[in-house]
């Protein structure tokens, strides 16, 4: 028998520095977790103790903090090289800065293979990108070889900016021939490493003949056997065992997100490459694991540029940006409008001639807007200003919801109106009218939404049975501020870009902004 240790991360999202337990900015260092310096310590410890170790990343290193905003992927290549990752699969967020934003900082600088079998380049890009990412890589590990085959969410064109010269194929259809090829090369230990979410990971384990292990990402799935060590609730045991269509037991793993855990899976193979046993658990990277001093010193060196960046002007406002709780928790506020407009702008993807865009709607809890920005400071807007408005380090995500769920969400928005509570929704691409004289749960008297399948966007009444795409904060997608109906009833959820980054990019693009209060949210006469 031959034993392999798979260490894995996914959806790190720019958390190079240690974070608080909820993966936001580290405040009390003694209680902080993750970060590349701490990860390095644990990886080195395991590499010294065990013979055949692979360190793999299942995508979405890009996007999530000011580190990515400033360094644009160079930080990913540098620190992943320093940790000596053995392979990485491309995630959807790796395309956030377009193909060039992937090629130059990461693909050309990585000292490890970057993989995806279901992304095919065409046109002029095909020769430019040739060899910079691969469908699979056969890696020597000890005296054996291990085949690693990559995959990426085929929804990437709707979630990021891969351009028109990359085709995202069905994962299973693309993986099978590559795995077959590895088999003909007598590679009998094959890991599928990819970024399509836990449901697809399980499907790959079931359907792709020859895959021995699946290491996934995208859905931030936490798996654990036994008592979990932190706040995350396991979606299943680690590893999650799938019985394949050809009768094999295939372990599937994922390691939550944000570098909080290091996935640790031990696999035992027989001489024919069959999995005999698999066991392990994610390792919580808490403060009991020291940060490596040399990596930490390097982090501190790279940090300097971030501090300078946060005080630079991104653009100007010529109006007061009202982000006060007195406004945003009670009525339409122009800060809410600005943020929602930025959220929609960040999701412009012309992927179908029938649609002007794939999404037109935004909702945003007023309680998530934490500060106004005064225009009397020469109109200057900095990252620092935006960090005061959006201090929680969240993301603006894409969900699919039925109209009936949206209606419930808007009823929840005003179910206890007047108490300055955070659930009051700011909107974009939506016109809502409330009648507060009516009883809670029946206060939405009009709800019109901007069409997407139209050449001239206009507002139409919400249809209860129709499925709509909506951009919203991850906080709401996860049921925050009492929006349990969103969490329970959403049909699809894809994590998006860092909230501050979305707004800062929009302001930089617009150069001068002047958001107004324009009647997106109205109250019917006599009730307000």
């Amino acid at each position: 028998a031959w034993e392999l240790t798979i260490l894995h991360t996914n959806d790190v999202h720019s958390r190079l520095e240690q974070t608080s337990e909820d993966s936001s900015k580290c405040v009390n260092a003694s209680r902080c977790m993750g970060g590349v310096a701490r990860l390095f310590t644990k990886v080195q410890q395991i590499r010294r103790a065990e013979p055949n170790v692979l360190l793999l990343d299942a995508g979405d290193q890009y996007q999530g903090t000011i580190w990515f905003t400033v360094y644009k992927g160079a930080e990913v290549a540098h620190f992943m090289n320093a940790l000596r990752y053995d392979a990485m699969a491309l995630g959807n967020h790796e395309f956030d800065n377009g193909v060039e934003g992937l090629i130059e900082p990461l693909l050309k600088e990585a000292k490890f293979p970057i993989l995806s079998a279901n992304i095919k380049a065409k046109g002029p890009l095909a020769s430019q990108i040739s060899g910079l990412y691969l469908p699979y890589k056969v890696l020597p590990v000890g005296d054996e070889v291990v085949g690693i085959v990559g995959y990426t969410s085929k929804e990437t064109p709707f979630l990021s900016n891969p351009g028109t010269n990359l085709v995202f194929e069905d994962e299973i259809t693309a993986l099978q021939p590559e795995v077959d090829k590895l088999k003909t090369l007598n590679v009998n230990k094959i890991i599928a490493l990819g970024h399509s979410g836990f449901e697809m990971d399980k499907l790959i384990a079931q359907k792709v003949r020859g895959v021995d292990v699946v290491v996934g990402g995208h859905s931030n799935t936490f798996l654990y056997t036994g008592n979990p060590p932190s706040k995350e609730v396991p979606a299943g045991k680690y590893p999650f065992i799938v019985t394949s269509d050809d009768g094999r037991k295939v372990p599937v793993v994922q390691a939550y997100a944000f570098g909080k855990y290091l996935g640790y899976l031990k696999i035992e193979f027989d001489e024919r490459g069959n999995v005999i046993s698999s066991h392990g658990n994610p390792i919580l990277l808490n403060s009991s694991i020291p940060e490596d001093p040399s990596i930490k010193a390097d982090i501190n060196k790279w940090r300097i540029k971030l501090d300078n960046y946060s005080t630079q002007e991104l653009g100007k406002t010529i109006v007061y940006l009202d982000g006060s709780s007195q406004s945003c928790r009670f009525r339409e506020c122009n800060m809410g409008n600005l943020i929602c407009d930025a959220m929609i702008n960040n999701n412009l993807r012309h992927t179908d001639e029938m649609f002007w865009n794939h999404v037109s709607m935004c909702i945003l809890n007023g309680g998530g807007i934490r500060s106004p920005i005064d225009e009397r400071n020469n109109g200057t807007i900095t990252w620092e200003n935006l960090a005061a408005v959006l201090p929680f380090g969240g993301t603006f995500d894409l969900v699919q919801l039925k109209g009936s769920t949206l209606k419930k969400a808007f009823e929840h928005s005003v179910h206890r109106y007047g108490q300055s509570t955070g659930e009051f929704l700011q909107v974009g691409g939506i016109h809502v009218v409330y009648d507060l004289s009516r009883k809670p749960g029946d206060r939405v008297v009009k709800l019109d939404v901007l069409c997407t399948k139209c050449r001239v966007p206009s507002y139409d009444p919400l249809k209860m049975d129709e499925v709509y795409k909506v951009i919203l904060p991850n906080f709401l997608a996860n049921g925050g501020d009492g929006f349990q109906m969103i969490k329970d009833e959403l049909l699809r959820h894809d994590s998006g870009d860092q909230d501050i980054n979305v707004v800062s990019t929009y302001i930089s693009k617009m150069k001068v902004i002047y958001p107004a209060v324009e009647g997106r949210i109205k109250f019917s006469t006599g009730s307000h």
């Epitope: 090289n81 000292k111 490890f112 430019q128 040739s130 691969l134 890589k137 020597p140 590990v141 090369l185």
Partner: antibody, heavy 122, light 110 residues
Framework: QVQLVESGGGLVQPGRSLRLSCAAS????????MHWVRQAPGKGLEWVSG????????GYADSVKGRFTISRDNAKNSLYLQMNSLRAEDTALYYC???????????????WGQGTMVTVSS | SYELTQPPSASGTPGQRVTISCSGS????????VTWYQNLPGTAPHVVIY???QRPSGVPDRFSGSKSGTSASLAITGLQSEDEADYYC???????????FGGGTKLTVL
């Protein structure tokens, strides 16, 4: 600047041993896989052996398997090739080469030394 | 014997375009990226193309590389006398667990 300097070559009788060394400077040695490549007089390049950044995986050409041993000392920024049971066909200029990455499983070597000559003859 | 097959020689006049082919199998070129080395007489080899088509800094853009299936090729446009050298292709062979080289192509500038 980035440099690889080989040493230890010379004239040796068939069946005897020789140890080649390669001293690296100008780059972080343990960030990279390292290789030995040889070129017999008037012939092409032939890969001899490779070693990953932490010696975790090692490979040899069939022609030297069981006779040659590659090793590295990251603390000393040095790569070695222990050559036993030498044969006339091992006569060649031996180059030390740095890989672009840290796995030995790739064929891109971006830095080469000037080589050390090994002559196996009675 | 070499796992990768190259023509032993190629030639061209100054200013011309020449291509050098490199043929392998599914276990080497078909499975990994190709590197091209230039070996000038009396000097150590150096990379002119890596990852099938990428040019290291300092290598003129007259050099380009491509790969299709189990074959790769190196193209040199606007041939110059200083391009006269031996050229080798190389890649990783998954079945052999070894780096493999082509036999080399001697390029003569007429």
């Amino acid at each position: 600047q980035v440099q690889l300097v080989e040493s230890g070559g010379g004239l040796v009788q068939p069946g005897r041993s020789l140890r080649l060394s390669c001293a690296a400077s100008g780059f972080t040695f343990d960030d990279y896989a390292m290789h030995w490549v040889r070129q017999a007089p008037g012939k092409g390049l032939e890969w001899v052996s490779g070693i990953s950044w932490n010696s975790g995986s090692i490979g040899y050409a069939d022609s030297v398997k069981g006779r040659f041993t590659i090793s590295r000392d990251n603390a000393k920024n040095s790569l070695y090739l222990q050559m036993n049971s030498l044969r006339a066909e091992d006569t060649a200029l031996y180059y030390c080469a740095k890989a672009r990455g840290y796995s030995y499983g790739e064929g891109a070597f971006d830095i080469w030394g000037q080589g050390t000559m090994v002559t196996v003859s009675s | 014997s070499y796992e990768l097959t190259q023509p032993p020689s190629a030639s061209g006049t100054p200013g011309q375009r020449v291509t050098i082919s490199c043929s392998g199998s599914s276990s080497n070129i078909g499975s990994d990226t190709v590197t091209w080395y230039q070996n000038l007489p009396g000097t150590a080899p150096h990379v002119v193309i890596y990852s099938n088509s990428q040019r290291p800094s300092g290598v003129p853009d007259r050099f380009s590389g491509s790969k299709s299936g189990t074959s790769a090729s190196l193209a040199i446009t606007g041939l110059q006398s200083e391009d006269e050298a031996d050229y080798y292709c190389a890649t990783w062979d998954a079945s052999l667990k070894a780096v493999v080289f082509g036999g080399g192509t001697k390029l003569t500038v007429l």
